[in-house]
């Protein structure tokens, strides 16, 4: 997956730090105070859909095959720049019953982006 | 994840059968002759306006939080209806060296859809 460098507008990973204080979650998330979540942005022209070596690749390639042929209903289905590889992270937080939970939360950090 | 039933236009899973003959792959894929790949389609309104947040990852929830507030750069970042749970499937096919390979291919079948 590409890292966004400002030079390309093709689907890429953009660095982004989430501050839990900024979104009002700091009184129930004990740790960390924030984290590098990152996000995906950029264009997904038809020729690169499903070619990023992403976790969606076989399915994306198949659907893209139909899409490129103008096959209904895929002709109008837009390929999207989305996370294709995410990483877990450990968090300490209060749950709904005010109990303290330490848990590895899946899919917190975007590692790679690709076209769906 | 929702199943598309024709009544809602919210992000949902649509049944779709892929015929390998249709896409010209039948000369190198020995078995199966096709499979239910399915795909995702539908709108991704702000999380709270959606009918279900149950398949949203933590990352999606956080980014959507910023997006709802019109926070740059997320205000113009579109949330996409994409696979959130995929299933593998076994395939028998010829590799580049014309060897017959039997392999469980990851992420072939879309099981659930959600908003990125």
């Amino acid at each position: 997956g590409l890292e966004c460098d400002g030079k390309v507008n093709i689907c890429c990973k953009k660095q982004f730090f989430v501050s839990f204080k900024d979104i009002g979650w700091n009184d129930w998330i004990i740790a960390p105070s924030g984290y590098h979540a990152n996000y995906c942005e950029g264009e997904c022209p038809s020729h690169i859909a499903g070619t990023s070596g992403s976790s969606l690749s076989f399915h994306s390639t198949v659907i893209n095959h139909y899409r490129m042929r103008g096959h209904s209903p895929f002709a109008n289905l837009k390929s999207c720049c989305v996370p294709t590889k995410l990483r877990p992270m450990s968090m300490l937080y209060y749950d709904d019953g005010q109990n303290i939970i330490k848990k590895d939360i899946q899919n917190m950090i975007v590692e790679e982006c690709g076209c769906s | 994840g929702l199943e598309c039933d024709g009544k809602v236009n919210i992000c949902c899973k649509k049944q779709f059968f892929v015929s390998f003959k249709d896409i010209g792959w039948n000369d190198w894929i020995i078995a199966p002759s096709g499979y239910h790949a399915n795909y995702c389609e539908g709108e991704c309104p702000s999380h709270i306006a959606g009918t279900s947040g149950s398949s949203l990852s933590f990352h999606s929830t956080v980014i959507n939080h910023y997006r709802m507030r019109g926070h740059s750069p997320f205000a113009n970042l579109k949330s996409c209806c994409v696979p959130t749970k995929l299933r593998p499937m076994s395939m028998l096919y010829y590799d580049d060296g014309q060897n017959i390979i039997k392999k469980d291919i990851q992420n072939m079948i879309v099981e659930e859809c959600g908003c990125s």
């Epitope: 129930w28 899946q106 899919n107 | 709270i48 929830t61 507030r69």
Partner: antibody
């Protein structure tokens, strides 16, 4: 400690409007959603809708769509629920409750409730 | 919308006995279900969340079980202060929906 304090009882005529307030304290207001739930005397609980205190985004129960408006004032940590075109069957105790909505953490239960506001609709 | 059906509507139990309340969902809500206790003139109080987790300060005699579509709230040995109405709510989907309630009364 967390508190949701609601405005006092109201008596309204059919066709009028009512605006109930819910003042939050003891937590970061914008970190939670505010849900509104009503209860006709002697009956069960009915979900009316929700507002994100962070963004102001709303989701209303279908049967109340067009008659209900939920708003927040983050400067005073107060949520409001306005119900218009009141009918006699709107006579109920109206509750606000806070919740998070983060499926990935299994969060979504209403953990704190206001004391309730009785709205009586009578000619 | 997801319909929650509670049974029985009324449960007559003697103090010290066990009470078993049921909540059935019209479709799977995973473990996104909570139980509330409500006494006359009071707001509901959270007892169980995540189908089986007890909220802070709730006595151990209250327990929840189930996932998907079938859920149970058990009060192992009823105390006088437990006679009340109990509601389940699902928070898997919008709209949020409540069960019709079970009234636990003294036999």
């Amino acid at each position: 400690q967390v508190q949701l304090v609601q405005s006092g009882a109201e008596v309204k005529k059919p066709g009028a409007s009512v605006k109930v307030s819910c003042k939050a304290s003891g937590y970061t207001f914008t970190g939670y959603h505010i849900h509104w739930v009503r209860q006709v005397p002697g009956q069960g609980l009915e979900w009316m809708g929700v507002i994100s205190a962070y963004s102001g985004d709303t989701n209303y129960a279908q049967k109340l769509q067009g008659r209900v408006t939920m708003t927040t004032d983050t400067s005073t940590s107060t949520a409001y629920m306005e119900l218009r075109s009141l009918r006699s069957d709107d006579t109920a105790v109206y509750y606000c409750a806070r919740a998070r909505d983060i499926a990935a953490l299994g969060l979504g239960a209403f953990d704190y409730w206001g004391q309730g506001t009785l709205v009586t609709v009578s000619s | 919308e997801i319909v929650l059906t509670q049974s029985p509507a009324t449960l007559s139990v003697s103090p010290g006995e066990r009470a078993t309340l049921s909540c059935r969902a019209s479709q799977s809500v995973s473990s996104n279900l909570a139980w509330y206790q409500q006494k006359p003139g009071q707001a509901p109080r959270l007892l169980i969340y995540g189908a089986s987790d007890r909220a802070t300060g709730i006595p151990a005699r209250f327990s929840g079980s189930g996932s998907g579509t079938e859920f149970t709230l058990t009060i192992s040995s009823l105390q006088s202060e437990d006679f009340a109405v109990y509601y389940c709510i699902q928070y898997s989907n919008y709209p949020r929906t409540f069960g019709g309630g079970t009234k636990v009364e003294i036999k």
